[in-house]
Each structure stands twice: as structure tokens, then as C-alpha cells.
Interface confidence: low
């Protein structure tokens, strides 16, 4: 399982250089973030390290209340903080990995990081 | 300001060919996906396809998947829907759509152009 | 594929009545959800994105509420402009992108 989320940590990083890029990447990770309320990899601060992507910026899926462009100068108690390979690694432990036994590369791949039937089974409140 | 503006449509016959056109200014073109979505005259709203801003993932409703392409000219900003295989259901207002992201919704959309499809 | 229902298909109101419309999905959506306005003969328009978020322009008479399966679209105090049909729309599992059936807000 380390192993599993070690691959998901590099894949969702691989994926954040490419979010500048790639609109059907940034609507991945814009969904991801959005629904488990983080941002970035570790932290928010992961989007500085990104070309392109400005030093005062997060994408807006980053913001705790989204709307277009709040990413952009964005106010840190505005924002989701938590990074998501966190707090999505603790889901799919609890809730895929131990129920599912899912294979790794369910959790791979250059397009999704963790299969569309995972993701659309977690509901949060 | 933004503009998408369709063409193309008219009437044909049940197993006919029209292509749709979608011509975009306002802003930058390449930036963005654009879908097409249809509703039939007194109908409610279908989408048919969409394609993403570099022109290299394209998704199709499975009711037209097989009978149209989509495809997208960045140097000429438009887009453009190729029906072939056209059936009397297929009859609707065909509209192009600027899809900014799939938190925002659909931000902009053409005026229509209609396709109608006669047996 | 997520189905979306409306309810109610139809409704009679006045004006300056408070207006509710619902709007629920066949499974978790979190707040992939918009709601667009269309008058006859028009294009639809964007009111409502990511749930509760208002488009530019529109105004604050409308609302949006609602994540995971459940929304609502709100005209606080309806106004003659307002009298027309509503759509919500899905964005969270694409494709398809799926829309509700509608729902038509007519002048009691």
C-alpha cells in the first residue's frame, strides 16, 4: 500500500505540472481538489513550484467558497490548505483499498489518478 | 465581447450529410473546450460532443456516436460538426458551447442553428 | 451515466412570489452542478455554476444551494423577466454531460 500511494503521490505531482497545459488534466485535478476540499500535493504551497502557475496563484478549485479567478491572489484562510495525496490516501485506504484490494494500476495511469468508479463513490459531507 | 456562431444548418433528407460550423471571437479560442448541444423543437437539452481545447480528446452522446465528428481549427477559431447517417431524431436546434472548465458551467453559447431532418 | 431530475416539471407563480426549484442526481455530484435559464426562441443561459456560485451579470434574486445529490435554484422575488424555463446540468462525471428535463415557470 506505501507503494500504492507513493505511485499516487508522483502521479498526482506529474499531473499538477501538467494542469497548465491540459484542460482535460486540470478538470481532473479541479474535481479531485474540489471535492476532498485540498490543494496540491502536500500543501497549497506545491502549486509554487509549477511553471506557469504565478506565485500568488492556486487553481480555484483550491478556494474554500469557488468562484472564478479566487485562486488568483488568493488569501490563504480562503483557500483549502490540506494537500490532497493526504487526505485522498486516507480515502482510498479506508474506503477502496481495504474494501476493493484494487490492483496499483487502478490508481495510475497518464489520464486518471484514481479510476472514475473510486472517485464517483465518495461522498462527502 | 464573446461570440460563437453557428451555421450550416438546414434541411435534408433522413440518411443525408450536413456539416455545422462554429466561428468564435472574444477571446482565446485555444483555451478552451467547446461541445455542441442540441434540443429538439419543444424538447429539453441533449449534449452531442464536446472537444477539448487542443483538439485531441473528443467524447460523442452514444445517440450520434459513429454518424458525426467533431473537430476544431485553432488558427481559424472555429469548430465544426460533421453529421452524416441523419435521422428523423436528430432533428433540433444544434447549439456551440464555450465550456471554460467543468466547475463553471457552459459561459457562452451560440445563438443556434437548426437541423431538420425530414423522411 | 448520472441522471438528473427536476421537480416540479412545471409551475405556476406571480409575480413577486418566492420560487424554489429542485434539482437531484442519481448519485454524488459534490458541487459539479449548474442552472441555466432559457426563454422561448433564445439560447439558455448561465445563472448558477458550481451549485451556488452566480455568473457575472446575473442578478442576486437568484440562488443556488446544495452538494453530493440534492440542489435547489431560488428566485427570492420574482420578477415578469423571469417567467421562463430552468435547467440543471451535471458536470461532475463526463462524459455524458447530463441535463435535467426542465422545468417551466409560468405566469399564474
Known amino acids: 500500500r506505501d507503494k500504492v500511494m507513493s505511485e499516487f503521490n508522483n502521479n498526482f505531482r506529474q499531473q499538477m505540472e501538467n494542469y497548465p497545459k491540459n484542460n482535460h488534466t486540470a478538470s481532473i485535478l479541479d474535481r479531485m481538489q474540489a471535492d476532498f476540499k485540498c490543494c496540491g500535493a502536500a500543501n497549497y504551497t506545491d502549486w509554487e513550484k509549477i511553471p506557469s502557475m504565478s506565485k500568488n496563484r492556486v487553481p480555484d478549485s483550491c478556494c474554500i467558497n469557488v468562484t472564478v479567478g479566487c485562486g488568483i491572489n488568493f488569501n490563504e484562510k480562503a483557500i483549502h490548505k490540506e494537500g490532497c495525496v493526504e487526505k485522498i490516501g486516507g480515502w482510498l485506504r479506508k474506503n477502496v483499498l481495504e474494501q476493493k484490494l484494487i490492483s496499483e494500476e487502478d490508481l495510475g495511469g497518464e489520464q486518471k489518478l484514481i479510476s472514475e468508479e473510486d472517485l464517483h463513490h465518495h461522498h462527502h459531507h | 465581447q464573446v461570440q460563437l456562431e453557428e451555421s450550416g444548418g438546414g434541411v435534408v433528407k433522413a440518411g443525408g450529410s450536413l456539416r455545422l460550423s462554429c466561428a468564435a471571437s472574444?477571446?482565446?479560442?485555444?483555451?478552451?473546450?467547446i461541445n455542441w448541444i442540441r434540443q429538439a423543437p419543444g424538447k429539453g437539452l441533449e449534449w452531442v460532443s464536446y472537444i477539448n481545447n487542443g483538439g485531441y480528446t473528443i467524447y460523442y452522446a452514444d445517440s450520434v456516436k459513429g454518424r458525426f465528428t467533431m473537430s476544431r481549427d485553432n488558427a481559424k477559431n472555429s469548430v465544426y460538426l460533421q453529421m452524416n447517417g441523419l435521422r428523423a431524431e436528430d432533428t433540433a436546434f444544434y447549439y456551440c458551447v464555450r465550456d471554460p472548465r467543468s466547475y463553471y458551467g457552459f459561459d457562452y453559447w451560440g445563438q443556434g442553428t437548426l437541423v431538420t431532418v425530414s423522411s | 451515466d448520472i441522471q438528473m431530475t427536476q421537480s416540479p416539471s412545471s409551475l405556476s407563480a406571480s409575480v413577486g412570489d418566492r420560487v424554489t426549484i429542485t434539482c437531484r442526481a442519481s448519485q454524488s455530484i459534490s458541487r459539479f452542478l449548474h442552472w441555466y435559464q432559457q426563454k422561448p426562441g433564445k439560447a439558455p443561459k448561465l445563472l448558477i455554476y458550481?451549485?451556488?456560485s452566480l455568473q457575472s451579470g446575473v442578478p442576486s434574486r437568484f440562488s443556488g444551494s446544495g452538494s453530493g445529490t440534492d440542489f435547489t435554484l431560488t428566485i427570492s422575488t420574482l420578477q415578469p423577466e423571469d417567467f421562463a424555463t430552468y435547467y440543471c446540468q451535471q458536470s461532475y462525471s463526463t462524459p455524458p454531460i447530463t441535463f435535467g428535463q426542465g422545468t417551466r415557470l409560468e405566469i399564474k
Open positions: 472574444g477571446f482565446t479560442f485555444s483555451d478552451y473546450y
Open positions: 458550481g451549485a451556488s
